[in-house]
């Protein structure tokens, strides 16, 4: 079994594992997440995504949290559970991300703009969030990116 | 309210180059896709460009690949165009365009500003 | 490369008319993923910039006037001026967005008797 999104395939990465370092996470992140009103990975974001779609979608969503979740969050942390923990999510999202490649096609036009969308719509709420709470809710919501993605896992 | 006020247009000679600049105000700037129109005198609307939010990824016309190039500042809300190798029939009025919002479905020009003229003759 | 065929190139009509005008794409310009006509139609005043009418083959830009609607599906679309008024009288131009380069029509002139 692989990741397949859309024509972009992922070998090497298990979503059990992925969900280990999670969970050892899970309760301390969504116990620091406040703001219950407000969701990052909003239905706009992920529902109804086409295969096509998934590949840059999940391109653009896992460069952000390597780029902007992960990076900001390790400055901010001590504990060395919680680094261990984000440490295996932010090496399996490079592994993710290195394999890869959505098409450059002129053709990809509207299908690569609808997922811009989509991730425009998730930046923007964590734009709108004070730096430390979207830090929080995003690294909170890393369940439902991967619930998200493992739609895409199959034989 | 939106305002997009281009800049840079000028008379330039036949392989010369020119940087047009627009700058943006009224709406959250990295928010949006960003792309330049232009308009030959006397003739319709031509696609030039196009920018992603973080310009990230470019799209250009045919006819103008490799030699113009689409970048933006978001710290500063600009947006550019590079044009280099420039020819007499790049004269026209040049348009930046603001993308629609990101939570429409589908894009297109929702905003303009008012233009710039590049004339290129010798 | 997507053309849009316009026709027809010019059109003169009294106050109050309908106007109808085409677009005919060279393929198909209705996204798989969602459905979504990605479709739009522009007005151009003389020495103005051009402003946005329609997105998405039928949906009224907001501001818009109400006699100003869109229609069509596929690779045949269509603007119709339901009562033309004399501020009317522009250039109209149809745009696909579909996939690059994007591209517009050549542009119907309408102009007011």
């Known amino acids: 079994q692989e990741f397949h999104f859309g024509p972009c395939q992922v070998k090497g990465v298990v979503p059990q594992k992925l969900w280990e370092a999670f969970w050892a996470v899970k309760d301390t992140m969504q116990a620091q997440d406040n703001i219950t009103s407000a969701r990052l990975l909003q239905q706009e974001v992920l529902q109804n995504v086409s295969d096509a779609e998934s590949c840059y979608l999940v391109h653009t969503l896992l460069e952000f949290y390597l780029k902007t979740v992960f990076k900001n969050y390790h400055n901010r942390t001590v504990e060395v559970r919680t680094l261990k923990s984000f440490s295996t999510l932010a090496n399996n999202f490079v592994l993710i991300v290195s394999q890869l490649q959505p098409s450059q096609e002129n053709e990809m036009f509207s299908i690569r703009d609808s997922a811009h969308r989509r991730f425009l719509l998730f930046r923007r709420a964590f734009k709108q969030l004070d730096v430390e709470a979207a830090l929080t809710k995003a690294l909170g919501e890393v369940d439902i990116l991967l619930t998200w993605m493992q739609k895409f896992y199959k034989l | 309210e939106v305002q997009l006020v281009e800049s840079g247009g000028g008379l330039v000679q036949p392989g010369g180059s020119l940087r047009l600049s627009c700058v943006a105000s009224?709406?959250?700037?990295?928010?949006?896709?960003m792309s330049w129109v232009r308009q030959a005198p006397g003739k319709g609307l031509e696609w030039v460009s196009f920018?992603?939010?973080?310009?990230?990824?470019?799209y250009y016309a045919e006819s103008m690949k490799g030699r113009f190039t689409i970048s933006r500042d978001n710290a500063k809300n600009t947006l550019y165009l590079q044009m280099d190798s420039l020819k007499s029939e790049d004269t026209a009025v040049y348009y930046c365009a603001k993308d629609s919002d990101p939570s429409i479905a589908t894009p297109y020009f929702g905003s303009w500003g008012q233009g710039t003229q590049v004339t290129v003759s010798s | 490369e997507i053309v849009l065929t316009q026709s027809p190139s010019s059109v003169t009509a009294s106050v109050g008319e309908k106007v109808t005008i085409n677009c005919k794409s060279s393929?198909?310009?209705?996204?798989?993923?969602?459905?979504?006509?990605?479709l739009n139609w522009y007005q151009q005043r003389p020495g103005q910039s051009p402003r946005l009418l329609i997105y998405?083959?039928?949906t009224q830009e907001s501001g818009i006037p109400d006699r100003f609607s869109g229609s069509g599906s596929t690779t045949d679309f269509t603007l119709t001026i339901s009562s033309v008024q004399p501020e009317d009288a522009a250039v109209y131009y149809c745009q696909q967005a579909y996939s690059a380069p994007l591209s517009f029509g050549s542009g119907t002139r309408l102009e007011i008797k």
């Open positions: 920018i992603t939010w973080n310009g990230g990824i470019t």
């Open positions: 998405s083959a039928s």
């Open positions: 009224g709406f959250t700037f990295d928010d949006y896709g």
């Open positions: 393929q198909s310009v209705v996204s798989g993923s969602n459905q979504k006509s990605y």
